[in-house]
Interface confidence: medium
């Protein structure tokens, strides 16, 4: 059987768990006595279409309720375990009163008020975080949602929505609470070499040192196998066997658009003629694949002072 819960002296409306998309009438019974629940609105507990309404609920209403959907060829029975709790004396909301947790991120910053669709409610919905009313402009209540601008980990906590259900000219309070957690939303992507450009030619002076930086970005978050490295004539620098040419270990950086990037620097202590004929490949790779930008060196033309 399914479970539903509510708070004493608040409205509670529940649906028959067997209803599916059925349009057939639903009858409700007290499971233990098999006594039928009436449809007259003057009763505190009554049936309305497929819904069972407690207006308001009392602790003694707790128990198992049966609903029967009568269709021409089949009767379907569902059971609902209803528990009405006393209001918690302190601000700490026990787990048994919590609806499902919402996991938010910088892209998902919306909390929906649980079960509100079952009620005849009117805006605005009031929202509380850890029992304090939310009044900062960052928090915006819209229809049944709470929107949070610029979400951070500080926004984690228990959020309670409070609204009124109107029935027969009487207003009833309803409150519902759920937790909100913030996930650092990482993403992974095929590596992008941001520098040097593709097929770049760099000017160097013979006998002088030269350094070429290679930077690549990989997305945001944890990066499995992400690396940036240099090859010379398709051989990794360590195996090339030229002590003058060294690769400086890749260092972590963050790009302007908040992506995780790595940089590796190729250093030549004294450029020789031979170095101009070599091909230098900057490789960036991660689990999605590998990209290569080839760089060539050319002699810097002396400035003509004529």
């Amino acid at each position: 059987s399914k479970s539903s819960w509510g708070l004493e002296n608040e409205a509670l409306i529940v649906r028959c768990p067997q209803r599916g998309r059925s349009t057939y009438p639903v009858e409700w019974y007290y499971s233990d006595t098999n006594e039928s629940i009436p449809t007259q609105k003057r009763n505190r507990i009554f049936v309305s279409r497929d819904r069972l309404k407690f207006l308001p609920a009392r602790v003694e209403d707790s128990g198992i309720y049966a609903c029967v959907i009568r269709s021409p060829n089949l009767n379907k029975t569902g059971y609902l375990n209803v528990t009405i709790h006393k209001k918690p004396p302190s601000c700490n909301i026990p787990d048994y009163l919590m609806y499902s947790t919402v996991r938010g991120s910088d892209k998902n910053f919306k909390i929906t008020c649980p079960t509100i669709d079952l009620y005849n409610w009117t805006a605005p919905v009031q929202w509380f975080k850890n029992c304090k009313a939310l009044q900062e402009p960052r928090f915006r209540a819209h229809r049944s949602y709470l929107f949070i601008d610029n979400v951070t980990h500080d926004d984690e906590g228990d959020y309670t929505c409070q609204f009124t259900h109107a029935e027969n000219g009487t207003n009833y309070i309803v409150t519902a609470t759920r937790s909100f957690t913030v996930e650092e939303k990482g993403f992974s992507m095929f590596p992008v070499i941001t520098n040097p450009p593709y097929n770049h030619t760099m000017e160097v002076e013979i006998g002088k040192p030269a350094s070429i930086a290679c930077s690549a970005c990989f997305g945001k978050g944890s990066h499995f196998l992400a690396d940036v490295l240099w090859q010379i004539n398709k051989t990794v620098v360590g195996n090339f066997g030229e002590a003058r040419i060294q690769e400086e270990e890749g260092r972590n950086e963050s790009s302007s658009n908040d992506m995780d990037c790595l940089t590796s620097v190729l250093r030549i202590t004294g450029v020789t003629e031979k170095d101009l004929s070599l091909e230098y490949d900057c490789l960036a790779l991660n689990l999605h694949g590998m990209i290569r930008h080839t760089i060539r060196l050319r002699r810097k033309q002396p400035i003509d002072h004529r």
């Epitope: 992974s188 490295l229 398709k234 689990l287």
Partner: antibody, heavy 116, light 107 residues
Framework: QVQLVQSGAEVKKPGSSVKVSCKAS????????MHWVRQAPGQGLEWMGV????????KYAQKFQGRVTITADESTSTAYMELSSLRSEDTAVYYC?????????WGQGTMVTVSS | EIVMTQSPATLSVSPGERATLSCRAS??????LAWYQQKPGQAPRLLIY???TRASGIPARFSGSGSGTEFTLTISSLQSEDFAVYYC?????????FGQGTKVEIK
């Protein structure tokens, strides 16, 4: 054309090791990753690990950590997968597969039977 | 790890009919999804990568769609050679994981 040719079927005793080879041809061996995937009889595909020849670095699925070693020999364009401490449930067809994330070329598979 | 779930486990289709296979990821894999075909006694063959790009030499009757957590492989008109097992695989995050497979059989 691009192809991966694997070594022949093996029958092994529980507790022993097996080393399967995968010779690549038709492409630049160091430019692509080499994955190993296994398939037990009548079962689905299970990723075991990957080697990046250009780095000489390998990464393994948690399940096989400590029991599998993947290596590559650039000079012969061959990748190897060694699985140790064999048990009967390691009986499977072992495939090497070229590619980065998606595996575009597969070896023909090597049947490894573990039986006492 | 990301769990890939395929449905249905078996699909019975008549030749010439359309087949629709589903694959769901336990969390978003963006478009880093591949589909493979495997026939008895053979190695798998890559059909689709990047969720919707056909691999080299794959007939146009195979198409892939979806992104995030829901993906579909559609075979528009089944030929006799298409009866096989189909696997989806994510390569968005380590470890790479496969679905359990959908067997497409002759009705």
């Amino acid at each position: 054309q691009v192809q991966l040719v694997q070594s022949g079927a093996e029958v092994k005793k529980p507790g022993s090791s097996v080393k399967v080879s995968c010779k690549a041809s038709g492409y630049t061996f160091t430019d692509y990753y080499m994955h190993w995937v296994r398939q037990a009889p009548g079962q689905g595909l299970e990723w075991m690990g990957v080697i990046i020849p250009v780095l000489g670095a390998a990464k393994y699925a948690q399940k096989f950590q400590g029991r599998v070693t993947i290596t590559a020999d650039e000079s012969t364009s061959t990748a190897y997968m060694e699985l140790s401490s064999l048990r009967s449930e390691d009986t499977a067809v072992y495939y090497c597969a070229k590619g980065w994330g998606a595996f575009d070329i597969w070896g023909q598979g090597t049947m490894v039977t573990v039986s006492s | 790890e990301i769990v890939m779930t395929q449905s249905p486990a078996t699909l019975s289709v008549s030749p010439g009919e359309r087949a629709t296979l589903s694959c769901r990821a336990s969390q978003s894999v963006s478009s880093y999804l591949a589909w493979y075909q495997q026939k008895p006694g053979q190695a798998p063959r890559l059909l689709i990568y990047g969720a919707s790009t056909r691999a080299s030499g794959i007939p146009a009757r195979f198409s892939g769609s979806g992104s995030g957590t829901e993906f579909t492989l559609t075979i528009s008109s089944l030929q006799s050679e298409d009866f096989a097992v189909y696997y989806c695989q994510q390569y968005y995050s380590y470890p790479w994981t496969f679905g359990q497979g959908t067997k497409v059989e002759i009705k």
